[in-house]
Interface confidence: medium
């Protein structure tokens, strides 16, 4: 058993049929010695008396908020949550495996630039009685500060018969050094509590590996006189790190015909303009990637040729 | 470069960008492999890193690029020695068309661009871990290439910025 926060405790249980469970001793936080009784949750049933209560925690029915009373007055509370371990593996019932980039990916994180700011998100099909708490640091043995904001419900989607909920959190490294080579990874720890079930999820990454620029902006087409060609231009996204002479992007451009089956020629360039043949009904698209490190490509930015 | 003269920024830019391409083609899948393990915080100290105080940020380069260039050169020599060591030359043998050979030569080329003949900056001691098992060697190759990718990315940014803003 360990303390998650004041008056909230997590009992770690090996979860299998007829498991013996864990013996837990609760102590009433009061100088009083006599006339103390214990109840669980809203039931008025007295579970025991005395300054301490010893219970055998085996299942969710044994978890909840234990309260010690004297003379009808509540003296202190202890909330017990359960953390299940099945076949030596902690349960992951609350969050959905996103399977990208590999199996057992419950948390996904992205950064738009090297400022030390990043966003993580996760998915669940649970809609109520759910709470999350996030902590983050750089490194684990001598952790450096990362500050995370409040968790928000960022999207709801219907998947077949089920509703899926996406939660996200934004974090910022306290003393980010955008130009340095990261030596220690960022660690993100998410506590998830559903009713009285506790689970925790972790992710470890370097900012450089989760970079995904925003799409290029201000796509413009300028037809060239007496030619089928057009000059296309675009700009770095506003959210990308500066100066651009240092934090450079490379671009992939393509012209896509109306038919998805039509062959697409992709061209790679470090410049922010190009000359292409842009037929009627086609569209021109461009995406960006860090020029010197192969992290994710941005989403496409597109503009119609006509 | 030593003693305060400017490097050939444009040449260094071209060669460092080539290094980035080679480092990723040497093991493109490395990007999708989770090679971090327990105790990695200690093992990552074995390779030189371009850190916050090394003056490799745009402001630091404007103030005095020498600190940063010396740091980059130390790292290049370190990786050049590693790529020429038993870790990469031993079993399992690299494929004949492996870009590691080109990567090795380019590391040497860039470090020499930063130190013309006759100048000798002191370089740090190069550790020579010699894992006995081929699988250990393979894992170490991945880890070295992974950290090299990060190192040369910063070096390439430095030279691109230098070429754009510090060239005479």
């Amino acid at each position: 058993i360990w303390e998650l926060k004041k008056d909230v405790y997590v009992v770690e249980l090996d979860w299998y049929p007829d498991a013996p469970g864990e013996m837990v001793v609760l102590t009433c936080d009061t100088p009083e010695e006599d006339g103390i009784t214990w109840t669980l949750d809203q039931s008025g049933e007295v579970l025991g008396s005395g300054k301490t209560l010893t219970i055998q925690v085996k299942e969710f029915g044994d978890a909840g908020q234990y309260t010690c009373h004297k003379g009808g007055e509540a003296l202190s509370h202890s909330l017990l949550l359960l953390h299940k371990k099945e076949d030596g593996i902690w349960s992951t019932d609350v969050l959905k495996d996103q399977k990208e980039p590999k199996n057992k990916t419950f948390l996904r994180c992205e950064a738009k630039n090297y400022s030390g700011r990043f966003t993580c998100w996760w998915l669940t099909t649970i809609s109520t009685d759910l709470t999350f708490s996030v902590k983050s640091s750089r490194g684990s043995s001598n952790p450096q500060g990362v500050t995370c904001g409040a968790v928000t419900l960022s999207a709801e989607r219907v998947r077949g018969d089920n509703k899926e909920y996406e939660y996200s959190v934004e974090c910022q490294e306290d003393s980010a050094c955008p130009a340095a080579e990261e030596r220690l990874p960022i660690e993100v720890m998410v506590d998830a509590i559903h009713k009285l079930k506790y689970e925790n999820y972790t992710s470890s990454f370097f900012i450089r590996d989760i970079i995904k620029p925003d799409p290029p902006k201000n796509l413009q087409l300028k037809p060239l006189k007496n030619s089928r060609q057009v000059e296309v231009s675009w700009e770095y996204p506003d959210t990308w790190s500066t100066p651009h002479s240092y934090f450079s992007l490379t671009f992939c451009i393509q012209v896509q015909g109306k038919s998805k089956r039509e062959k697409k020629d992709r061209i790679f360039t470090d410049k922010t303009s190009a000359t292409v043949i842009c037929r009627k009904n086609a569209s021109f698209s461009v995406q960006a990637q860090d020029r010197y490190y192969s992290s994710s490509w941005s989403e496409w930015a597109s503009v119609p040729c006509s | 470069v030593p003693g305060g003269s400017s490097p050939a920024w444009a040449q260094c830019q071209q060669l460092s960008q080539k290094l980035c391409t080679l480092a990723w083609s040497a093991h493109p899948l490395v990007g999708h492999m989770d090679l971090r393990e327990e105790g990695d915080e200690e093992t990552t100290n074995d390779v030189p890193h371009i850190q916050c105080g090394d003056g490799c940020d745009p402001q630091g380069l404007r103030d005095n690029s020498q600190f940063c260039l010396q740091r980059i050169r130390q790292g290049l020599i370190f990786y050049e020695k590693l790529l020429g060591s038993d870790i990469f030359t031993g079993e399992p043998s690299l494929l004949p068309d492996s870009p590691v050979g080109q990567l090795h030569a380019s590391l040497l080329g860039l470090s020499q661009l930063l130190q013309p003949e006759g100048h000798h900056w002191e370089t740090q001691q190069i550790p020579s871990p010699s894992p006995s098992q081929p699988w250990q060697r393979l894992l170490l190759r991945f880890k070295i290439l992974r950290s090299l990718q990060a190192f040369v990315a910063v070096a390439a940014r430095v030279f691109a910025h230098g070429a754009a803003t510090l060239s005479p």
């Epitope: 926060k5 709470t131 904001g149 409040a150 928000t152 | -």
Partner: nanobody
């Protein structure tokens, strides 16, 4: 949009009791946390206590523990703050706050709450 309406404030003697109510309207509150805060002029709003709507689990600031009790009536969609053994230093404007979905187990800081009531004045005379 969620509105929170507090009631029950007023004047009480030291050692006496008051019961505040907070009724959220405009949205069902399943799975959220409902908190109470208080503020005296010139000071920052201070956490008093919170109840997790489903389950009725409660958490209190040390300064009120044992004297104040938060409860909820699901049928009436109302949260209560029962204040016993009142002290003059409990004098403040009391605010009800709500969080959906709650961002931490027992949210205790201002920024974790999405919705706030207008506040109700509680004065304790010695």
């Amino acid at each position: 949009e969620v509105q929170l309406v507090e009631s029950g404030g007023g004047l009480a003697q030291a050692g006496g009791s008051l019961r505040l109510s907070c009724a959220p309207s405009g949205r069902a509150f399943s799975g959220s946390a409902m908190g109470w805060f208080r503020q005296v002029p010139g000071k920052e709003r201070e956490f008093v206590g919170v109840i997790i709507w489903t389950g009725g689990y409660t958490y209190y600031a040390d300064s009120v523990k044992g004297r104040f009790t938060i409860s909820r009536d699901s049928a009436k969609n109302t949260v209560y703050l029962q204040m016993d053994s009142l002290k003059p230093e409990d004098t403040a404007v009391y605010y009800c706050a709500a969080r959906t979905p709650n961002s931490s187990w027992f949210p205790t800081t201002l920024y974790e709450y999405d919705y706030w009531g207008q506040g109700t004045q509680v004065t304790v005379s010695s």
